[in-house]
């Protein structure tokens, strides 16, 4: 039950995260005009990954797409790539995780297959979240660098009278959406990986046992058990005759469905 809940919650958290990554990627407010020196501008500038916009006091908003590919800064291209990779991986992860959900039955899919799919989707979500966080962080770093560079050259005087104010940009809403969304996708991925451990078929774990002479009676005792990751050796259905021996952690041993009684 706890495994199903963890898996389900991981899926939902990742779904919200990926939706957020998509939203952040599409948003125009990656960078917004810094109003510190001019809080009452009648023209407000903001930029996204795909276009830049100007909102005027009149209520008119004009957006222009970046119609060039080669003319764009390499950093912007890198951020675009990271966000797209994050979305693609996240989308594939979502698709895989739907089939991996314990509450959904598809034919006679074995638990080991579901465990593998859960782990795969979890890893995809983790990488997707990291891509989004990396993309947003690279853009933020680019903004900080440009901000201080433009601050240094903020006013260029012409005879001391005329001032040309350079537009400075600061963090836009999309950055915060991206960071939160990337974090959620990452958390969702981790939850899926945790759920995977509980989903895998249980396997017998053989501990070192100490033998004691106990007459002629031979008792069958179940060994200790370890949750399988789905990649380990399958050593189910092995009988252990321990002649009254006790494993060191027998207190934590429980019979599995594969044990003979």
């Amino acid at each position: 039950m706890a495994v199903t809940a963890c898996q389900g919650l991981g899926f939902v958290v990742s779904l919200i995260g990926i939706a957020g990554i998509i939203a952040a990627t599409c948003m125009d407010q990656w960078s917004t005009q810094d109003l510190y020196n001019n809080p009452v501008t009648a023209v407000f500038n903001y930029q996204g990954l795909w276009r830049s916009c100007v909102r005027e006091s009149s209520g008119f908003t004009e957006c222009r797409g970046y119609f060039t590919l080669l003319g764009l800064p390499a950093m912007l291209q890198a951020v675009r790539a990271l966000m797209i990779v994050g979305i693609v991986l996240g989308a594939i992860g979502l698709l895989v995780s739907i089939f991996a959900l314990k509450c959904i039955r598809i034919g006679s899919m074995e638990d080991s297959a579901k465990a593998n799919m859960t782990l795969t989707s979890g890893i995809m979500f983790i990488v997707s979240g990291l891509c989004a966080i990396a993309g947003v962080s690279v853009f933020a770093n680019m903004l900080v660098t440009n901000f201080w560079m433009s601050t240094a050259n903020m006013y260029t005087g012409m005879g001391g009278m005329v001032q040309t104010v350079q537009t400075r940009y600061t963090f836009g809403a999309a950055l915060f959406v991206g960071w939160v969304a990337g974090g959620l996708t990452l958390i969702g991925g981790v939850m899926m990986c945790i759920a995977c451990r509980g989903l895998a078929p249980e396997e017998t774990n053989y501990k070192a046992v100490s033998y004691h002479a106990s007459g002629h009676s031979v008792a069958y005792k179940p060994g200790g058990f370890k949750a399988s990751t789905g990649f380990g050796s399958n050593t189910k259905n092995k009988k252990i005759y321990d002649g009254g021996a006790r494993t060191e952690d027998e207190v934590q041993s429980y019979p599995s469905k594969h044990d003979y009684v």
């Epitope: 001019n38 501008t41 500038n45 009149s58 040309t164 537009t167």
Partner: antibody, heavy 120, light 113 residues
Framework: EVMLVESGGGLVQPGGSLRLSCAAS????????MSWVRQTPGKRLEWVAT????????YYLDSVKGRFTISRDNSKNTLYLQMNSLRAEDTAVYYC?????????????WGQGTSITVSS | DIVMTQSPDSLAVSLGERATINCKSS????????????LAWYQQKPGQPPKLLIY???TRESGVPDRFTGSGFGTDFTLTISSLQAEDVAVYYC?????????FGAGTKLEIK
């Protein structure tokens, strides 16, 4: 046809109050940012205040901040300017003007103006 | 505040001749976001409210005769009337539309010589 008609002007004593109204017609009032601009006896034009379409943002000339309040009633297609603590330097013709949507914040339509004289 | 300085204060031009009015701002009215200049020109005839002629420094308002031309960039702007007509006698104002307060120039009185 776009029409802006101001009213509420007159003679007022220093320290007194007055409320100007501007009735708008011929356009979707709620969509447009509206402004008050005054013209002093020396014929200088001076922007006074601006209010955006939804009424959420207002901007004021420093010398009128705290004394004047711009507001709008979109259901009545009316713009207001509440003027308190009036001074002699507030004497002017007050125009109600519309900020054009695609005119780069320029004022594309103006009313005929209403005159205010602040004198004792 | 952005200070708008108009020159000359008054101008007398013969009918059919070119009239040029200058406007200088203390700060750039150019917006890098959309590569536009936020400056407007108005015409005011006696007893009338101002009328918008030019916005965005160079775009003519609809209905304005093509003899009126706006030009300039950043801090220096010009309004040119290519062939002065009798009805062009008025006071012309430039206005900063970039930053609040939306300041106006002192005006240039245009007369017929």
């Amino acid at each position: 046809e776009v029409m802006l008609v101001e009213s509420g002007g007159g003679l007022v004593q220093p320290g007194g109050s007055l409320r100007l109204s501007c009735a708008a017609s011929g356009f979707t009032f709620s969509t447009y940012t509206m402004s008050w601009v005054r013209q002093t006896p020396g014929k200088r034009l001076e922007w006074v205040a601006t209010i955006v379409g939804g009424g959420g943002y207002t901007y004021y000339l420093d010398s009128v901040k705290g004394r004047f309040t711009i507001s709008r009633d979109n259901s009545k297609n009316t713009l207001y300017l509440q003027m308190n603590s009036l001074r002699a330097e507030d004497t002017a013709v007050y125009y109600c003007a519309r900020m054009g949507l695609t005119q780069r914040n320029a004022l594309d339509y103006w009313g005929q103006g209403t005159s205010i004289t602040v004198s004792s | 505040d952005i200070v708008m300085t108009q020159s000359p204060d008054s101008l007398a031009v013969s009918l059919g001749e070119r009239a040029t009015i200058n406007c200088k701002s203390s700060q750039s009215l150019f917006n890098s976001g959309n590569q536009k200049n936020y400056l407007a020109w108005y015409q005011q005839k006696p007893g009338q409210p101002p009328k918008l002629l030019i916005y965005g420094a160079s775009t003519r308002e609809s209905g304005v005769p093509d003899r009126f031309t706006g030009s300039g960039f950043g801090t220096d702007f010009t309004l040119t009337i290519s062939s002065l007509q009798a009805e062009d006698v008025a006071v012309y104002y430039c206005q900063n539309d970039h930053t609040y307060p939306l300041t106006f120039g002192a005006g240039t009185k245009l007369e017929i010589k």
